[in-house]
């Protein structure tokens, strides 16, 4: 939560923003509220982004004023016009991209004064539900060494990967994780666990997106000996 106050000259007003994260390829909301004014025509909202020459968005005299808008935001922004009068200056952002991450400023002018507050906006893409594969995948017996691969796709930024057994005990040894960026800059994650089988065993992989606070889970259970394991584990 960031609360900003006004600039000298006029009275200052309180402007409040909340740091947030947006999903790539979806709508995002940059939150900003301010002390409301009784006349919509007296309210000016300007959104700016650090390192961007033009404005992100401007709303004044009750309507959008986009003559100064930077081209990277053209057709991608809107305020909630019916909520401006009650102090909502939040911005709707279309089709969030990696490049939208950064520091934004919500700058407000009303008849009561001026104020601004910064907002840190992060962007991310959720990781897909992991697919689990086993090698070898048949004639498994206790004491065999198997390789379990957990694969999750099209996330951003790089993931954190955790393995655990059926009792929730972390498995940290013999884990190799690789992350490769695709042509869009999104990451595909492959994590490999080498483990010696017990009589029965559940092995779980958790792929965490640190920005979106999103967890994707996959698990495989090996029961009964001897057994034949399907090439694609269902979970």
């Amino acid at each position: 939560l960031i609360i900003g106050f006004g600039i000298s000259g006029r009275h200052s007003i309180t402007v409040t923003t909340v740091a947030s994260a947006g999903n790539i390829g979806e709508d995002g909301i940059l939150s900003c509220t301010f002390e409301p004014d009784i006349k919509l025509s007296d309210i000016v909202i300007q959104w700016l982004k650090e390192g961007v020459l033009g404005l992100v968005h401007e709303f004044k005299e009750g309507k959008d004023e986009l003559s100064e808008q930077d081209e990277m935001f053209r057709g991608r922004t809107a305020v909630f016009a019916d909520q401006v009068i009650v102090g909502n200056a939040s911005l709707r952002l279309k089709n969030v991209q990696l490049t939208d991450a950064g520091t934004y400023k919500c700058y407000i002018i009303t008849s009561k004064g001026k104020g601004n507050a910064n907002l840190e906006y992060k962007t991310g893409a959720p990781y897909s539900k992991p697919s689990m594969t086993l090698e070898p995948n048949k004639d498994l017996r206790p004491g065999d060494t198997v390789t379990i691969t957990c694969s999750s796709y099209r996330g951003y930024p790089e993931a954190e990967v955790f393995w655990q057994d059926g009792q929730g005990v972390p498995l940290t040894g013999n884990v190799t994780t690789s992350q490769m960026a695709n042509e869009q800059g999104l990451f595909d994650v492959h994590s490999v666990l080498r483990v010696v089988l017990g009589a029965n065993g559940t092995y779980s992989c958790l792929v965490r997106n640190p920005v979106l606070q999103q967890d994707a889970h996959g698990s495989v259970t090996i029961t009964g000996q001897p057994m034949t394991f399907p090439p694609e584990a269902l979970w």
């Epitope: 390829g25 968005h57 959008d64 004023e65 003559s67 089709n95």
Partner: antibody, heavy 121, light 107 residues
């Protein structure tokens, strides 16, 4: 109620130009993008381009670039589509449509009735 | 430019049938896919936008889903008034693109 009323049918000769109008009412004209779409007889929908009346910004389908111009007159809340160097394959119904989402370019949620443009020698 | 490949181009179905139409984007991924219904001599009508949001006034038998490059329009129980042509629209990028259309005919 949002309404888009288009100009009447046109018959043009190959090589000529046509200008179709779309008069908007029931909302703030300068706050929403307006798009143009065409449909040749028995064919599918084809996006031509759009304009933000509040600033005159335009986007065009690469296929029509150089031949198409989208303009607006804010005093009459009217958008225009002009297509030049007409050929027989430009014979189609031309639709204007308002884009949802205000200054945000959304999907086309309200449509005009369509204008039939026939290109024939 | 992104192309939208729609399938099937036509289908025959009966009243009460469940109907599924798909659209595949040539590249990229975002949720900005809308679905339209068009009847002969009429302008298209918006049914669904942002992949799965139903336009007000549209019956709940229409639903949309999808992610990545693959998107689907489903009519859970086809009604007589649903026989029409359906189009998908990709509107996430600078340049918009329609699918080729799917004609739903009476079997």
């Amino acid at each position: 109620e949002v309404q888009l009323v288009q100009s009447g049918a046109e018959v043009k000769k190959p090589g000529a130009s046509v200008k179709v109008s779309c008069k908007a009412s029931g909302y703030t004209f300068t706050s929403y993008w307006i798009g143009w779409v065409r449909q040749a007889p028995g064919q599918g929908l084809e996006w031509i381009g759009d304009i933000y009346p509040g600033g005159g910004y335009t986007n065009y389908n690469e296929k029509f670039k150089g031949r198409v111009t989208i303009t607006r007159d804010t005093s009459t809340s009217t958008a225009y589509l002009e297509l030049s160097s007409l050929r027989s394959e430009d014979t189609a119904v031309y639709y204007c449509a308002r884009l949802d989402g205000s200054s945000y370019r959304g999907a086309m949620d309200s449509w005009g009735q369509g204008t039939l443009v026939t290109v024939s020698s | 430019d992104i192309q939208m490949t729609q399938s099937p181009s036509s289908l025959s179905a009966s009243v009460g049938d469940r109907v599924t139409i798909t659209c595949k984007a040539s590249q990229g991924f975002n949720k900005y896919v809308a679905w339209y219904q068009q009847k002969p001599g009429k302008a298209p009508k918006l049914l669904i936008y942002y992949t799965s949001t139903l336009q007000p006034g549209v019956p709940s038998r229409f639903s949309g889903s999808g992610s990545g490059r693959d998107y689907t329009l489903t009519i859970s129980s086809l009604q007589p008034e649903d026989f029409a042509t359906y189009y998908c629209l990709q509107y996430g990028n600078l340049l918009y693109a329609f699918g080729q259309g799917t004609k739903v005919e009476i079997k």
